[in-house]
């Protein structure tokens, strides 16, 4: 069958029919439905929502919808023994205690099962000691403290402000510095945008608001007790002492009212520079300990949370492909939330729901996609991407042979300024072409394309007239598909103006105030930005599942590989003497990139010319495109990070949220001047250049003519 015969209508008409069926009003209705009660992973409420989504997806017309369950390690506060932090006097009396819960938002005062703020997977403990303020607790912040200021965090409780990097990296850094506890807080400098009121009168964080979140360092492992394998009924589980990524010191989050009470008494060293000062009326002294009058007072943490193996549920929906049912395009986003999930994740889940409904409507009219589309509602994302990772571990053999693409669908909005896209270079042209066909929802861009408003508001730093597209990092459910399995992946959402809003994420992230009303009143009253995100995500899935030739352009990978090679070479060239001494050469990498560029160019020419009516040749060319991303996977993984196997991209070792290019070489070069054995360190740089060069060359050869 030709594609058109199989799919009943002309491809262009199908795409238009699909997009026209997406309705803002439906997304609004779904968001409301998904946000009335908390849906914490492992709870009965979230199981019920899974069954509701399963039922509705069936009604919408999917061929099958199944629940996939796993028993994974989760973490909860002790209901009868709350977590808090105290200031204690010399007699051990608690003279100040941090809050036990957030003041509930209006209309939600009688909602039960709101989990109080906590740092998921914190060990239990009641450490007490002097406080040290460590800014954002980034690698560079600890360098400043330890190397420049000669401040020792060993045996201290550190207090760090949220923002800039993933909280798990902060905790890891504090542990390595010898701290015995970590307090995380939201500073108004990062979570209170000037000129905007606090919730419920605006979208800013009130003083009693607190960001929840996990503090794991899983490095892609999934369930901490079953790394590499699904947490199924017959799983062998590690003991807790051997679990992957658990923190070893107590950690707890607080809001800025409580932070004020802890920071206002700080003594010791003054902040090293203005970048260490937030917006509270406190000196931001680094410590250690409190100032003169209060020097005998200490800080004490009381953490009683427990880790428990708990059942979680993914919802997996299938829309079978008419021509290539063994090729999978996946749209997935999580369902579990910390509390109401007004933005994270339900603004994304509502969009997925409407995309499923639109695809179902087309299917009921006799249409099918060329390739199979899988829809996923993941569980336990907030606890370390557990649902998606366990499912991918269980289905890894199918996915590595059949996975065409994965499109992520967490929060649809983190602002309402412009589009934000992170994806594999293979999808650049798909995203460009699609956004040129979509209408911009932005004020002042009526009648203009989304591409135009996006490019104007978020221009590419390298190519004029093009929009910025970022590297994939992690911190979301695409991780296992991209970083471990090498399946081409992408994500899209509406974002804030990064130039004028310097706060990290959005102010109410992971707080009780992330409600339906937050979205409906302040972010997107008409749900036009949600609709646009639905069109982008849905449009990408449609094209990936339905275009005769996969909409991947391998030449764009060639361009970025050259850029990344130049960048890593320039980092290495900061050490010209050592490069000479240890005979470090990037020639092999640049040669491989050159070969890749030439072969990709020739492949693209063949792609234009081949006989698309020949199903064998079509399948062969498509397979070369599908398997290109896979070719960047090193089966041995990155050093000490076996589940990060992509040689071109990995989550930064210093910030899980950020993507790093040529991560093996980057990490080998990082802080190399401080290594005790320079010969060994530069030897590892050389080995990583070798691995990268080999991988790029091997990937290039997958695009060569097959015989």
């Amino acid at each position: 069958k030709s594609s058109n015969e199989a799919t009943n209508i002309t491809p262009k008409h199908n795409m238009k029919a699909f997009l026209d069926e997406l309705k803002a009003e439906n997304i609004k209705k779904f968001l409301y439905n998904f946000t009335q009660i908390p849906h914490l992973a492992g709870t009965e409420q979230n199981f019920q929502l899974a069954k509701q989504i399963q039922s509705q997806w069936k009604e919408f017309g999917l061929d099958s919808v199944e629940l996939a369950h796993y028993d994974v390690l989760l973490s909860y506060p002790n209901k009868t023994h709350p977590n808090y932090i105290s200031i204690i006097n010399e007699d051990g009396n608690e003279i100040f205690n941090t809050s036990l819960f957030e003041p509930p938002p209006p209309g939600y005062e009688n909602v039960s099962d709101i989990v109080p703020p906590f740092s998921a997977f914190s060990p239990q403990g009641m450490p007490e000691g002097d406080l040290v303020y460590v800014n954002y607790a980034r690698t560079e912040d600890f360098f400043k403290l330890e190397r420049d200021m000669k401040i020792n965090c060993s045996g201290k409780i550190v207090i760090a402000r949220y923002g800039k990097v993933f909280r798990g990296n902060k905790v890891k850094n504090a542990q390595l510095a010898g701290a015995k506890g970590v307090i995380l807080y939201s500073d108004p400098a990062d979570y209170f945008a000037p000129g905007v009121k606090s919730y419920p009168d605006g979208w800013n964080l009130p003083g009693g608001g607190v960001q929840r979140g996990n503090i794991l360092n899983l490095n892609g492992a999934g369930d901490p007790l079953t790394p590499g394998y699904p947490a199924n009924e017959y799983a062998y589980r590690r003991g807790i002492a051997e679990a992957v990524g658990l923190p070893s010191i107590p950690v707890h989050p607080i809001g800025y009212y409580d932070a004020q009470k802890l920071l206002e008494k700080m003594g010791g060293s003054a902040p090293p520079d203005s970048s260490w000062r937030g917006s509270l009326k406190v000196p931001y002294n680094v410590g250690p300990g409190f100032t003169g009058n209060f020097s005998t007072q200490k800080v004490k943490m009381h953490i009683h949370s427990t880790n428990e193996v708990t059942r979680i549920y993914n919802v997996i929906g299938t829309l079978r492909g008419a021509v290539e049912p063994d090729r999978y395009v996946i749209l997935g986003g999580h369902r579990d939330s910390w509390v109401f999930g007004g933005i994270d994740p339900q603004s994304g889940a509502a969009v997925v729901h409407e995309i499923v409904r639109s695809f179902g409507t087309l299917k009921k009219e006799g249409w099918r996609p060329r390739r199979t589309i899988l829809f996923a509602s993941w569980d336990a994302e907030e606890f370390g991407l557990l649902g998606s990772t366990e499912w991918a571990e269980e289905n890894s053999r199918l996915l590595q042979e059949r996975g065409v693409a994965y499109i992520n669908a967490d929060s649809s909005i983190e602002g309402n300024y412009t589009l934000r896209v992170d994806c594999t270079p293979l999808m650049y042209s798909l995203v460009h072409n699609l956004t040129k066909e979509l209408k911009s929802p932005d004020e002042g861009f009526e009648g203009k394309s989304l591409y135009e408003s996006w490019t104007k508001k978020s221009p590419s730093p390298e190519f004029s007239g093009m929009p910025r597209i970022s590297k994939l990092g992690s911190g979301n459910d695409f991780e296992v598909f991209f970083q471990r399995l090498g399946i081409a992946s992408g994500r899209a959402r509406y974002t804030k103006n990064w130039e004028t809003n310097k706060f990290s994420g959005y102010p109410l992230y992971h707080s009780v105030y992330e409600t339906y009303e937050l979205v409906e009143k302040f972010y997107d009253p008409m749900f036009k930005y949600h609709l646009t995100v639905a069109q982008v995500r849905g449009g990408m899935v449609f094209e990936l599942a339905n275009s005769i030739v996969l909409p991947f352009d391998c030449r764009d990978y060639a361009v970025v590989l050259r850029k990344y090679a130049d960048k890593i070479y320039s980092i290495s060239m900061k050490h010209p003497q050592e490069m000479k001494t240890y005979s470090v050469s990037f020639d092999s990498l640049f040669s491989a990139v050159k070969n890749f560029t030439e072969i990709a160019s020739k492949f693209s020419e063949r792609l234009q010319d081949f006989d698309k009516s020949n199903p064998i040749v079509l399948r062969m060319m498509n397979d070369q495109l599908m398997f290109l991303e896979r070719a960047f996977i090193d089966p041995l993984g990155l050093p000490d990070r076996p589940f990060y196997r992509h040689v071109i991209y990995a989550p930064s070792s210093h910030n899980k949220y950020a993507g790093e290019s040529f991560p093996g070489i980057y990490d080998a070069l990082f802080d190399i001047e401080s290594k005790v054995d320079p010969s060994k360190a530069w030897g590892e740089v050389k080995r990583q250049i070798y691995v990268a060069a080999f991988t790029v060359q091997a990937a290039a050869e997958t695009l060569s003519e097959v015989a």
Epitope: F96, N97, S99, L100, F101, P103, P206, G207, Y257, D258
Partner: nanobody, 123 residues
């Protein structure tokens, strides 16, 4: 409408105990710090005690420390003041007052007051 209603006052002998209640209506008590304030006959207002919205912190005037206990039951939208070892100088009209800032960790300005309940300590 938004209001606070105190109850539990009366005449009591020195050294005895009394428990005052303050029922809130028209607003969610759970979000606000609450205070007890008193006014002795012919005197100005004196702050007595404060409890944070979640009950995690309680602060007392030196004059009542160790004798009075402020508490709350958010599910009943009610504030309490347990007064033990009462003295003649505790004679006053006792008012409950709502803190104006949601989630405040220390006493701030008050924006809603009750009508007060009279406590007389006399032998």
């Amino acid at each position: 409408q938004v209001q606070l209603v105190e109850s539990g006052g009366g005449v009591v002998q020195p050294g005895r105990s009394l428990r005052l209640s303050c029922a809130a209506s028209g607003f969610p008590l759970i979000s606000y710090g609450m205070n007890w304030v008193r006014q002795a006959p012919g005197k100005g207002l004196e702050w007595v005690a404060f409890i944070t919205y979640d009950g995690s912190n309680r602060y007392y005037a030196d004059s009542v420390k160790g004798r009075f206990t402020i508490s709350r039951d958010n599910s009943k939208n009610t504030l309490y003041l347990q007064m033990n070892s009462l003295r003649a100088e505790d004679t006053a009209v006792y008012y409950c007052a709502k803190d104006r800032i949601v989630g405040a960790r220390v006493p701030d300005a008050y924006d809603i007051w009750g009508q007060g309940t009279m406590v007389t300590v006399s032998s």
